[in-house]
């Protein structure tokens, strides 16, 4: 960065460096430069010269000064017009920053997903700070009193390996930068009430031409947990609301869920699951793409949902989905 | 020596365009803003447009944003001014100056602009 | 916009006069003020920058001084060359302004 430049002088930013984004600022620039009393001094920001608000403190130093700086990152330099100088001489160069404190981190939540050999710590850091902004998750034993302590800088996988101190900790967030710290509420979990069954997969659906036609959707999951709670949702492409249906599932074999729907109109399928009883679900699942018939019977496998769209849901959970060749309208 | 030499003005009717021309000599012209000032006969001093060392940001008054356009080429060492749909009150000598946070330091000789039917 | 006020508008001296020329801004400039002579059918030419230091080859009997929002150009014993018109301008805040000019003729 422009940090790395060789001065011949000094430059200086009051209150500091990294500063609270919106606040008035002053950059002094003080000319060391051998055989030159300067004319004039100046300022760049982002390569462009500043015009405006310059006040010649001495013969060698200047102030710029910014109301209301809001630029996250700036690379400020000043220079100097020596007599019998062709070009200006560079003085010296820093790098700014504004920013804000962090916020106090909240919802905290530790997952397990099953087979990953992790727990997942994630929380909602707030506003953005614009700034180098660290997290220290600390994650205590309740039994053994002891704490370990991981730096990062969003959310963080700590292998369940590491955890030898029993099933029953406290986890809480620190944030910290340059403008501030802050700590979240402590959050206690058991690590058996905080596993997340391996995902849940709509795998294909048919329609069966009976008296009154009936749709199967075909789902699995990997998981070895016993018990298991499941929900699948599902709605017309063109309605905003869904209808969800509850099952108590045993994964020993693959699901067969049964829908009476409306003919010739396209569906969209997701499904998730929870430990029965326990705290988290599942995130949905990617969104399965069924159109019932007029008529004749049809099956619609996943193999057959290649083309990858945006669903444009308004539902914070839905990942990118699969649609079937036949027909590419957004869901409405 | 430094030198700012404008040129393109001349007479032109209501509602036509101009564009004038200032070539820089003899000093860092990439490094230095750049303003276009016009003085009415036997008025005071006017800046019509500015426009930072990069070519990044301009700045225009009010009576004549909309119409005038200031731009650069910094590997020509030339500053430019198109004036559109020119009225009677934008009769004046332009000049072409460089602008510091000491002042205008340099300014070329100027160059009349007469709008008249 | 920062309004300048300057005064005289006109005055007449006489040669190896002093005269002194004022200028009063709408708000602190913080010494960013310059001050410019146009001699007759000419450029304006920058003789004086942040308040009071003299551009270079300006005579020595140019002299400017001020601070805040009151500023004055003072010229040492008139010379006959120094028949012109002189602005200030400042230039701290965006955009620069002129005063509206001060004629200096010989009586």
């Known amino acids: 960065g422009i940090t790395n430049i060789n001065c011949s002088g000094h430059i200086w930013v009051e209150p500091a460096t990294i500063f609270k984004m919106g606040m008035n600022i002053s950059i002094y620039c003080q000319a060391a430069i051998k055989n030159c009393q300067p004319r004039k001094l100046h300022f760049y920001k982002n390569g462009i010269k500043e015009r405006f608000q310059i006040t010649r403190i001495n013969k060698t130093t200047a102030r710029l000064w910014y109301k209301n700086f809001l630029e996250p990152h700036a690379s400020m330099y000043c220079t100097a017009e020596c007599p019998k100088h062709f070009q200006e001489t560079l003085i010296c160069g820093k790098d700014i920053s504004s920013g804000y404190p962090p916020d106090i981190p909240d919802e905290v939540t530790c997952v397990i997903y099953e087979y990953s050999g992790n727990m997942t710590c994630t929380w909602n850091a707030g506003k953005l700070t614009y700034i180098d902004t660290k997290y220290v998750v600390h994650v205590k034993s309740l039994e053994t009193e002891e704490e370990q302590q991981y730096l990062t800088s969003s959310y963080i996988n700590i292998s369940t390996d590491s955890l030898q101190g029993g099933k029953k900790y406290l986890v809480w967030v620190q944030a910290a930068n340059a403008l501030g710290m802050e700590e979240s509420k402590q959050l206690q979990i058991h690590l058996d009430d905080i596993v997340i069954p391996s995902a849940a997969v709509i795998s294909r659906a048919e329609t069966i031409n009976a008296t009154v036609p009936k749709t199967i959707i075909y789902w699995d999951s990997q998981t070895t947990i016993e018990k298991v709670s499941c929900e699948m949702r599902y709605k017309a492409t063109t309605n905003q609301t869904w209808n969800v249906k509850e099952f108590d599932t045993n994964f020993t074999y693959v699901q067969q869920s049964e829908f009476y729907l409306e003919p010739n109109i396209k569906y969209v399928f997701q499904v998730r699951c929870q430990e029965t009883g326990k705290r988290y679900w599942q995130p949905w699942s990617s969104l399965f793409f069924h159109k019932t018939p007029e008529t004749v019977p049809q099956v619609t496998s996943k193999a057959f949902q290649h083309d990858t769209w945006n669903s444009g849901l308004t539902v914070a959970s839905i990942s990118t989905g699969h649609l079937t060749s036949d027909n590419r309208g957004d869901i409405g | 020596e430094v030198q700012l030499v404008e040129s393109g003005g001349g007479l032109v009717q209501p509602g036509r365009s101009l564009k004038l021309s200032c070539v820089a000599s003899?000093?860092?012209?990439?490094?230095?803003?750049m303003t276009w000032i016009r003085q009415a006969p036997g008025k005071g001093l006017e800046c019509v447009a500015s426009i930072t060392n990069t070519g990044g940001s301009t700045y225009y008054p009010d009576s004549v944003k909309g119409r005038f356009t200031i731009s650069r080429d910094n590997a020509k060492s030339t500053l430019y001014l198109q004036m559109n749909s020119l009225r009677s009150e934008d009769t004046a000598t332009y000049y072409c100056?460089?602008?510091?946070?000491?002042?205008?330091?340099?300014w070329g000789q100027g160059v009349m602009v007469t709008v008249s039917s | 916009d920062i309004q300048m006020t300057q005064s005289p508008a006109s005055l007449s001296a006489s040669l190896g006069e002093t005269v002194t020329i004022e200028c009063l801004a709408s708000e602190d400039i913080y010494s960013n003020l310059a001050w410019y002579q146009q001699k007759p059918g000419k450029s304006p030419q920058l003789l004086i920058y942040?308040?009071?230091s003299l551009n270079d080859g300006v005579p020595s009997r140019f002299s400017g001084s001020g601070s805040g929002t009151q500023y004055s150009l003072k010229i040492n014993s008139l010379q006959s060359e120094d028949v012109s018109i002189y602005f200030c301008q400042q230039n701290y805040y965006s955009p620069p302004t002129f005063g509206g000019g001060t004629k200096l003729e010989l009586k």
């Open positions: 003899g000093f860092t012209f990439n490094n230095s803003w």
């Open positions: 100056s460089r602008e510091d946070n000491s002042g205008y330091d340099y």
């Open positions: 942040y308040a009071n």
